[in-house]
């Protein structure tokens, strides 16, 4: 807290300009009018203030707007945003995408801070859903943003927004998140032709069910091993050797290097050894010839 002292003669600020750089903390407190600061916030970021000086300016704005800053001030906070706490931000009502962009720009290149997370949360809640423009903006600044959301939060993403998602945006998503995103992607890209559709849907396939993988295997897609390894194990297990061969195309040879890893390992255990042998890859661990496979889950369902 800065002590209340009288402003020295001739030092009263008539405008927010660079001469304030050399004001001490108590001089800023005494000589800068809060209302003047609020109307000229756009100038603050162009002036190389120290963090100590920004603390004083924040204190002045807090006194002027105890219920939270108006958006006209928020949009021009610039580096002053770095001094805000999540509690401060929860008082704001940010509706403009331009305001969001301006504040994210200040934090650019840094990890997502609690302040930024709170700001995004306030903004998205205010909009009611993650629309395409917002998602575009957020993933541009934070490629991992989408994967930081819970499946419940992801459910508010409209399919139209999926067009904004780049493959790297999904790198850290877990299967539960992809389960939510995949149906949206399928809907978003449904009018594309085979090869184009596969390029777009590929990053989301970690949420695809067996029947969709079977359908893809009929389309000569040549899925790479990296994508195959991210598929849901329960979706891969029912695929036949022939279907996997068609799905992977020339990449089928890569199965040998992955035979000890899921989902390949578990899939091998479910296949007949003589079917695996047709691939000519030396895959071992399939069901020996002559053995009968009982599907107990079907048995339970019937009884």
């Amino acid at each position: 807290e800065v002590e209340k002292t009288a402003c020295p003669s001739g030092k009263k600020a008539r405008e927010i300009d660079e001469s304030l750089i050399f004001y001490k903390k108590w001089e800023l407190e005494a000589c800068v009018d809060a209302a003047l600061l609020a109307t000229q916030m756009d100038r603050v970021n162009a002036i190389p203030f120290t963090y100590e000086q920004l603390d004083v300016l924040k204190h002045k704005l807090d006194e002027l707007y105890p219920q939270g800053y108006p958006e006209s001030v928020i949009q021009h906070l610039g580096y002053l945003f770095l001094k805000m706490s999540p509690e401060d931000i929860r008082k704001w009502n940010v509706t403009s995408l331009e305001t969001l962009k301006a504040l994210l720009e200040v934090n650019k290149g840094h990890e997502m801070s609690p302040q930024v997370a709170t700001l995004i949360d306030r903004f998205v809640k205010g909009r009611g859903q993650l629309d395409k423009d917002t998602l575009d903006t957020l993933t541009a600044f934070y490629p991992g943003y989408l994967c930081s959301l819970s499946p419940e939060e992801l459910s508010s993403v409209p399919p139209s927004s999926i067009w904004a998602v780049r493959p790297q945006d999904l790198d850290t998503c877990d299967p539960r998140q992809l389960d939510v995103l995949y149906p949206k992607a399928r809907l978003a890209f449904q009018n594309m032709n085979g090869s184009e559709y596969f390029v777009k849907i590929q990053s989301f396939l970690g949420g695809a069910p067996t029947e969709d993988l079977k359908a893809l295997s009929q389309q000569n897609v040549s899925m790479d091993l990296a994508t195959f390894m991210k598929l849901r194990t329960d979706a891969v297990l029912p695929l036949t050797v022939a279907e996997v061969q068609k799905l992977l195309g020339p990449h089928v040879e890569g199965l040998k290097a992955e035979e000890r890893h899921r989902p390949v390992r578990d899939w091998i255990l479910r296949q007949r050894q003589d079917d695996l042998d047709t691939l000519g890859l030396g895959l071992q661990g399939g069901i020996p010839n002559g053995y009968l496979v009982l599907d107990l889950s079907m048995q339970e369902a019937l009884s």
Partner: nanobody, 128 residues
Framework: EVQLVESGGGLVQPGGSLRLSCAAS????????MGWFRQAPGKGRELVAA????????YYPDSVEGRFTISRDNAKRMVYLQMNSLRAEDTAVYYC?????????????????????WGQGTQVTVSS
């Protein structure tokens, strides 16, 4: 890379004047605070003058107020220190310093840590 080169130092009699120059290369000068520091033998560096990016604001400690004047010419990428009424205690190596970092500083402008680029220094000796 930014380079700051000082010139104009030398030997001067008490009461005399000198004009120091600092030439900056490698980056535009228009958005940064510039300062002049000095370091007398066996002492730490002290700020003797600082100037705002566009030159509208200046700072001087009491020890040089009224005798020293800092100015800048951003078009020429130059910063100057006009020193009048020189005294023996003004004898020191004078350094030009600049802060180019765009984000707010943790240090205050009169401390060395505020500045991120320094010149090699020029010797000023005041003696009869």
């Amino acid at each position: 890379e930014v380079q700051l080169v000082e010139s104009g130092g030398g030997l001067v009699q008490p009461g005399g004047s000198l004009r120091l120059s600092c030439a900056a290369s490698g980056r535009t000068l228009s958005s940064n605070v510039m300062g002049w520091f000095r370091q007398a033998p066996g002492k730490g560096r002290e700020l003797v003058a600082a100037i705002t990016p566009r030159g509208s604001g200046t700072y001087y400690p009491d020890s040089v107020e009224g005798r020293f004047t800092i100015s800048r010419d951003n078009a020429k990428r130059m910063v100057y220190l006009q020193m009048n009424s020189l005294r023996a205690e003004d004898t020191a190596v004078y350094y030009c310093a600049a802060r180019f970092a765009p984000d707010p500083a943790f240090s205050v402008y009169w401390s060395e840590n505020y500045y991120d680029y320094w010149g090699q220094g020029t010797q000023v000796t005041v003696s009869s």
